[in-house]
């Protein structure tokens, strides 16, 4: 099976100056030791074995390599150097591979489990001897490292000074190309088929390709506006209608086949329009209303569908009352007109203001434009009325109005009536036809860059920091508000203030904690810990003081009290030969005069008998919630998610590579990022449209309303459908446009907008 990731170790240097084995013997195995005359030049044939296992606070070199193991070929003699990992080394190795060479110093250990981040690494240098299998006699050096590493491309350098040899190497963990996360157990492989249409982002999340959506990016994004209740799509950009629905957006029901003067709300209905009946709404129930067949004032009565009867007034007869008998008997002339019988029937003589065959038409008295001064004429029965502009009155707007009666002047002493107008006498500070505009009294009175605010017949200066007074002419004490943090001293200046910060702080307000350990002030090898506005030096046993520069008296108050010497007597009068082990496994006993002793402790241990491991975590060196693990003469920080580095003080840039789509700007956060989206976009990575509506969403002047992930069109009169593309007009019912054409109706006429590949009046 394919690995989830790889642990890579690149050996870059090994120095075995004496060319000896860990046992002290020479590599060539002829019994010589370094002490007995030294070993020869390049006697060792050095190769390296690597063992990777679970994290052990106290490393045990034995036991299985539970995470994997590997080995190099023979890399060189007593000492050798290889190109280091990183850019320069990668180039050198690429050249070597191009020449057909393998990379000798690289050990790659694949793993098929979630990377646990913590690990133990044991590196052994061996002398190769083709006569023997590896045994402890041929071991040159064994070094170990227990720690934590996150998957990334960067290499981490490790240096080891062993008993015999010095090793330099780099390590890293990399996820396989389709695995992601800090543990390499999140699988994502880009694909573009029915199982999903996606690429993978930097975190291994599926990023849908254009036109696809859903958790697995299998669902097609249908045409915008498609009514997903009655339609859908299997490929992007389509809108395929369910049975019984039609139209570009599947928002029109299919009426009953052959339905003439009817419509549907649900498919296969034929709901008749007013005055139409029958299964197909093709029977005219109001022949009278739609055809008006009865003439000469005859009354029409609807009979059976498509049938009618005329009841004729006196003097008329015929199916449609078209035959005149005694025409004037029925007083056909309206509005006081006089009737005269003529051979064809009758004639009406109309009074003033009326016209037409029966004096039913009102004559337009506004035709002569009687209204003066731009007045609007309204025709009335036998007359007219003028609607005058504000400044004029009278029947034909010929008289000047007194505008002052309406009190138009707002901030004035008086109002004067003029011909066709008026005049307002303004109070100081106001201007305009109605004294409604405040005069700008600001004319550069404010000093020292003050901002002028206009008032009624006056002004006010808004002064910059450090100034006051009516014209900002007075200097203010900026230090009065104690703006300096961390005990900084404030100095008032002409244009503000300046903070003089105490040691350990900087910034305009002394708000920045300076790293006082750069460069380290600690002496005699003491470790420096940066504190807020201060630092702490962890002094070795024999030095004290703030900077560990003061030597300590090893035995305060006099000579050390004798417990025992460094040796124990083997018998009376015999010198001390056997070590008593008083200094334990981490100290060396030094005999002093008078039977006294002192213990010289190994690095990392302290106390009279070197039994105490110095707690290197005391200064809480791990930042940002990192967990500190004390080790011998060292500590290790296990960082929380989102932080890395030896002290958990490095926040990796989550904006690389840029996760923001649609020109969004990325801001790096802790183990996260924020995309500031461009106008019109939203979502974690600016991948969603902010607004569903644009100028083209609703047709025919419809108003679009955004409702989250969809939209609604409010249609103007005469239009319906989800995008106002369906005419209510009967000229489009039933739809005369075939082959998917869209009908656009206007009154009794219509036109068809045909789909690609079709043309003609009805897209035939």
């Amino acid at each position: 099976a394919r690995p989830m990731g790889y642990f890579e170790l690149q050996l870059s240097a090994l120095r075995n100056v004496n060319g000896e084995l860990l046992s002290g013997a020479c590599c060539d195995g002829d019994g010589r030791t370094t002490r007995a005359g030294g070993c020869g030049h390049d006697e060792c044939d050095t190769y390296v074995r690597v063992c990777l296992k679970e994290y052990q606070a106290k490393v045990t070199p034995t036991g299985p390599c539970s995470y994997g193991h590997g080995a190099t070929p023979v890399l060189g003699g007593n000492s050798f150097y290889l190109p280091p990992a990183g850019a320069a080394g990668d180039r050198a190795r690429a050249r070597a591979r191009a020449g057909g060479d393998q990379d000798p110093g690289l050990v790659v250990i694949p793993f098929q489990f979630a990377w646990p981040r913590s690990f133990t690494l044991i590196v052994e240098a061996w002398d190769w001897d083709n006569d023997t299998t590896p045994n402890e006699e041929l071991l040159i050096e064994r070094v170990s490292h227990a720690g934590m590493i996150n998957p990334e491309d960067r290499w981490k350098s490790l240096h080891f000074s062993g008993h015999v040899a010095h090793l330099e190497l780099q390590i890293r963990v990399r996820c396989d190309e389709n695995y992601y996360s800090a543990t390499c157990n999140k699988f994502c492989r880009p694909r573009n088929d029915f199982f999903g249409h996606y690429t993978c982002d930097q975190y291994g999340n599926k990023a849908c390709m254009d036109g696809w959506m859903g958790k697995e990016c299998k669902e097609a994004v249908c045409k915008q506006g498609c009514n997903l209740l009655h339609g859908g799509c299997t490929v992007p950009g389509e809108c395929r209608c369910s049975y019984g629905w039609q139209g570009r957006f599947c928002d029109e029901c299919v009426p009953y086949p052959g339905c003439v003067h009817g419509s549907c709300v649900e498919p296969w209905q034929c709901n008749c329009e007013t005055n139409w009946g029958g299964l197909l709404c093709d029977k005219d129930l109001n022949y009278c209303g739609s055809h008006h067949p009865c003439t000469n004032g005859g009354t029409c009565i609807n009979a059976e569908p498509d049938q009618y009867r005329c009841t004729c007034p006196d003097g008329y007869s015929g199916r449609n009352c078209e035959k005149a008998e005694h025409a004037c008997t029925s007083n056909p002339c309206a509005n006081g007109g006089s009737c005269h019988e003529v051979p064809s029937g009758f004639e009406c003589h109309c009074p003033s203001g009326w016209s037409g065959p029966t004096c039913a038409l009102d004559i337009d008295e506004c035709a002569s434009n009687p209204c003066a001064a731009g007045g609007t004429c309204v025709d009335q029965v036998d007359g007219f009325e003028c609607i005058c502009p504000e400044q004029w009155v009278g029947a034909t707007c010929q008289l000047d109005a007194n505008e002052c009666e309406g009190k138009p002047c707002l901030n004035a002493f008086s109002c004067k009536n003029l011909i066709g107008g008026y005049y307002c006498d303004c109070i100081p500070g106001w201007k305009g036809i109605n004294c409604h505009i405040n005069v700008n009294d600001c004319r550069g009175q404010c000093q020292h860059g003050g901002t002028c605010k206009d008032l009624v017949n006056g002004y006010q200066c808004v002064c910059p920091r450090g100034f006051g007074g009516r014209h900002c002419e007075l200097e203010r004490d900026e230090c009065a508000s104690s703006p300096c943090h961390s005990g900084g001293l404030c100095e008032d200046l002409a244009d503000g203030f300046h903070c003089h910060c105490p040691q350990g702080f900087s910034g305009p307000l002394c708000e920045v904690d300076v790293d006082l350990c750069e460069p380290s002030p600690c002496r005699n090898g003491a470790r420096c810990y940066n504190l807020e506005g201060d630092y702490y030096c962890a002094c070795p046993d024999d030095f004290g003081g703030k900077n560990c520069s003061v030597p300590r008296e090893p035995c305060p108050g006099g000579a050390c009290r004798v417990i025992d010497g460094c040796g124990s007597d083997a018998g009376p009068g015999m010198p001390g030969t056997a070590a008593s082990g008083v200094c334990g496994p981490h100290g060396r006993c030094v005999s002093q005069p008078g039977g006294n002793f002192s213990c010289i402790c190994d690095s990392g241990f302290t106390g009279t008998y070197c039994h105490e491991n110095i707690d290197d975590c005391l200064g809480q060196p791990c930042r940002n919630g990192g967990t500190c693990i004390d080790e011998v003469d060292a500590f290790r920080c296990f960082c929380p998610s989102g932080w890395e580095g030896e002290l958990c003080d490095t926040n990796p840039n989550d904006c690389l590579p840029d996760p923001c789509h649609s020109r969004g700007r990325c801001y790096d956060l802790v183990n996260d990022f924020y995309c500031a989206c461009d106008d019109g976009w939203k979502g974690k990575t600016c991948h969603s449209r902010e607004f569903q509506c644009d100028a083209y969403t609703c047709s025919n002047g419809g108003t679009c309303y955004d409702s989250g992930d969809t939209f609604r069109c409010a249609c103007p009169p005469g239009w319906k459908g989800s995008t106002c593309a369906v005419a209510k007009n009967s000229s489009c019912l039933p739809n005369p446009c075939v082959n998917g054409g869209t009908c656009v109706g206007s009154g009794a006429s219509f036109s068809c907008i045909c789909r690609d590949g079709w043309e003609g009046r009805t897209c035939t």
Partner: antibody
Framework: EVQLVESGGGLVQPGGSLRLSCAAS????????IHWVRQAPGKGLEWVGG????????DYANSVKGRFTISADTSKNTAYLQMNSLRAEDTAVYYC????????????????WGQGTLVTVSS | DIQMTQSPSSLSASVGDRVTITCRAS??????VAWYQQKPGKAPKLLIY???FLYSGVPSRFSGSGSGTDFTLTISSLQPEDFATYYC?????????FGQGTKVEIK
Amino acid sequence: EVQLVESGGGLVQPGGSLRLSCAASGFTFTSYDIHWVRQAPGKGLEWVGGISPADGDTDYANSVKGRFTISADTSKNTAYLQMNSLRAEDTAVYYCARNDYDVRSVGSGMDYWGQGTLVTVSS
Amino acid sequence: DIQMTQSPSSLSASVGDRVTITCRASQDVSTAVAWYQQKPGKAPKLLIYSASFLYSGVPSRFSGSGSGTDFTLTISSLQPEDFATYYCQQSWTAPPTFGQGTKVEIK
């Protein structure tokens, strides 16, 4: 050499169950999809369903959804088709096939097929 | 589901003939089309993938073309071993679907 070997076919009564296995060898099992395709006697090919062993993602034909389940054991390099509530119309030769996929090429096709195993549903 | 309609359903041809089989998709399937050859009692064999790419080991007399909804498999010079049934298959949207097959017989 790439090989896919189906097993587990046989005669079963309507409403019964059967489990087919597809043992894969000669390639990295988690780098490919495994599909099940069936062919009724004298008829054409019909896709039944598929699995991506690397992440366990599955998909099924509408005709078998809710009755058939596809799974994979990456330690054994084997895919399984669990068939429940079998009907007479499920009678067919069942093939398992390997499908490579790549974002750069669509429709990469099923490049290796097993020899097929016959499933007969009859009373 | 997307329908894949093959034509003709069967054809008779002689050795050396140029044979063309077409496959029409009911909707746009990009270039996600593969072609297979199947002989009686045997499993299908992949010939063409991604509409026009020849699968390794397949003779160069086989070729494929098309995109969107119309696809073609062409055998430039029919050989005795080419008499078989040919299927097209789309893998653009779920479920993947096969054509009904085209049987190529000896005239």
